[in-house]
Amino acid sequence: QVPPQYPPIQSIRVQFTRCENEKGCIITSPSKDETMKVQDNSIIINCDGFYLISLKGYFSEELSLSLYYRKGRGPLFSLSKVTSVDSIGVAYLAFKDKVYFNVTTHSTSYKDIQVNGGELILIHQNPGGFCAY
Amino acid sequence: QVPPQYPPIQSIRVQFTRCENEKGCIITSPSKDETMKVQDNSIIINCDGFYLISLKGYFSEELSLSLYYRKGRGPLFSLSKVTSVDSIGVAYLAFKDKVYFNVTTHSTSYKDIQVNGGELILIHQNPGGFCAY
Amino acid sequence: QVPPQYPPIQSIRVQFTRCENEKGCIITSPSKDETMKVQDNSIIINCDGFYLISLKGYFSEELSLSLYYRKGRGPLFSLSKVTSVDSIGVAYLAFKDKVYFNVTTHSTSYKDIQVNGGELILIHQNPGGFCAY
């Protein structure tokens, strides 16, 4: 008898090379095999549970950056007046949540911010919990 | 044939709003659905393996805080003279371990320390390993 | 019917008590039960996917330390002129990758660097993905 296989874990790695002041960062998923999807510049959460979240990037100018998951809730990450980020966190997310950026720069110019090595990874930690597809 | 489901992963999120000087933090589990249990102000470990541990909180005064798992062993986290914590770690824990706080304040007063956003998350990383229930 | 068990997750904890200047750190796996293997002072990656990586250690002198996984690729961690490390990261690794250290000291002496509490943990986050054994 073949031993049971794991169903694929919900996870995604998105990249971002550009952030817009007073808006967010433009995210793209480099792989077609991701088990989570990007829609309207947000990562869509289908499965309830804890998520491991990794955020990295080097910015062309000083900015304040927050990563949100739900309107009216505090951010998953909040970084004030930084030129780079390399953070890891754990958060409980649920079906219908959407993970997205908010960015503010401190310059008078409203140019886009360029990003090197911009990467956001989400990995579900509670397979076996509720999912809605 | 129905694909196999994941058995639930051992994980828990506890909250704490108060810590007692020379003692620990009073932990409560907001959800009844947790797969791990709190007993005598400690999180009980039933399954051997690596655990992802996230610890957050904002304290009403400066304190030194340690998170222990076994008598005679070094702490999982140890923070000295802080007013907030936002840390992530990985540790190998085993059946019979108990995760609990120890707190010391540096004020002459022996008041309780109030905590905002106090949260401790443990997530088992080795399902399939030994568990004793 | 017995519920399906999890196949063991790919994970390993290695220890290192000594690093060689211009080379790497000598890693040993204290447990025979690890699901990943050490070969030629490197941790062998058999399974594609995200890995949670924890790196800790206290060094006898200041050094610069990098953790690599593939020739021609940037490091997983890179620390410059430190006497200790306590870092967590997430990275996508794949079959044929090998995780290994590179170390440089800034002293004229070419003595080995002694390490207290030197520990590197890797935990696969995408069971169910491709593995080659």
Partner: antibody, heavy 118, light 106 residues
Framework: EVKLVESGGDLVKPEGSLRLSCVVS????????MSWVRQAPGKGLQWVAY????????SYTDAVQGRFTISSDNAKNTLYLQMNSLTTEDTAVYYC???????????WGQGTLVTVSS | SYVLTQLPSKNVTLKQPAHITCGGD??????VHWYQQKLGQAPVLIIY???SRPTGIPERFSGANSGNTATLTISGALAEDEADYYC?????????FGGGTHLTVL
């Protein structure tokens, strides 16, 4: 000199919305928790909401939970209170206050008046 | 939720001591802060951590806290001390104020 200046108070109809702002200066905004405290006409002080220094943690008094949202923008040194589904019971002067050690309120703004009436 | 009880009003003769109390279950285990609010003005922190005075607050203001009662004392009340006084603690991720005591200086 520490200064907190509230704005955004107005006359609004029941079930309406309002957003209050509090611009701070004289201290490093991103290092301190902040709160909103209100005072109904002729009544005592009532704590409304708290937000941590990094904006990641917040809490509310039961009376406003689910209707009010506290937020901050460290880039702009500004604290906000988004108030939805307002009722006449929300009529008050709203103060923003900086948290000190022991979670006291060591600096206050002068307040902004919110009137909910049809 | 935690409740702090204050008497609504208190009279004191000029230059005499005034004692304003704040009752709460085992309040002695908590840090109590006191605020003064004059008519038409924002509150001002006058005592923190039970008995400490911020810079600029006159020495006639002092505080104590034990058992189920915290006390604010004005050693010799002046006309300018006529105001509302509020006690405050933090409990279970929420701030709690007493109902306030209006002090009248006669």
């Amino acid at each position: 000199e520490v200064k907190l200046v509230e704005s955004g108070g107005d006359l609004v109809k029941p079930e309406g919305s309002l957003r209050l702002s509090c611009v701070v200066s004289g201290f490093t905004f991103s290092r301190y928790g902040m709160s909103w405290v209100r005072q109904a006409p002729g009544k005592g002080l009532q704590w409304v909401a708290y937000i941590s220094s990094d904006g990641r943690s917040s809490s509310y008094t039961d009376a406003v939970q689910g209707r009010f949202t506290i937020s901050s923008d460290n880039a702009k040194n500004t604290l906000y209170l988004q108030m939805n589904s307002l009722t006449t019971e929300d009529t008050a002067v709203y103060y923003c206050a900086k948290l000190g050690r022991g979670f006291n309120f060591n600096f206050w703004g002068q307040g902004t008046l919110v009137t909910v009436s049809s | 939720s935690y409740v702090l009880t204050q008497l609504p009003s208190k009279n004191v003769t000029l230059k005499q001591p005034a004692h304003i109390t704040c009752g709460g279950d085992n309040i002695g285990s908590k840090s109590v802060h006191w605020y003064q609010q004059k008519l038409g003005q924002a509150p001002v922190l006058i005592i923190y951590y039970d008995s400490s005075r911020p810079t600029g607050i006159p020495e006639r203001f002092s505080g104590a806290n034990s058992g189920n009662t915290a006390t604010l004392t004005i050693s010799g009340a002046l006309a300018e001390d006529e105001a509302d006084y509020y006690c405050q603690v933090w409990d279970s991720s929420a701030s709690v104020f007493g109902g306030g005591t209006h002090l009248t200086v006669l």
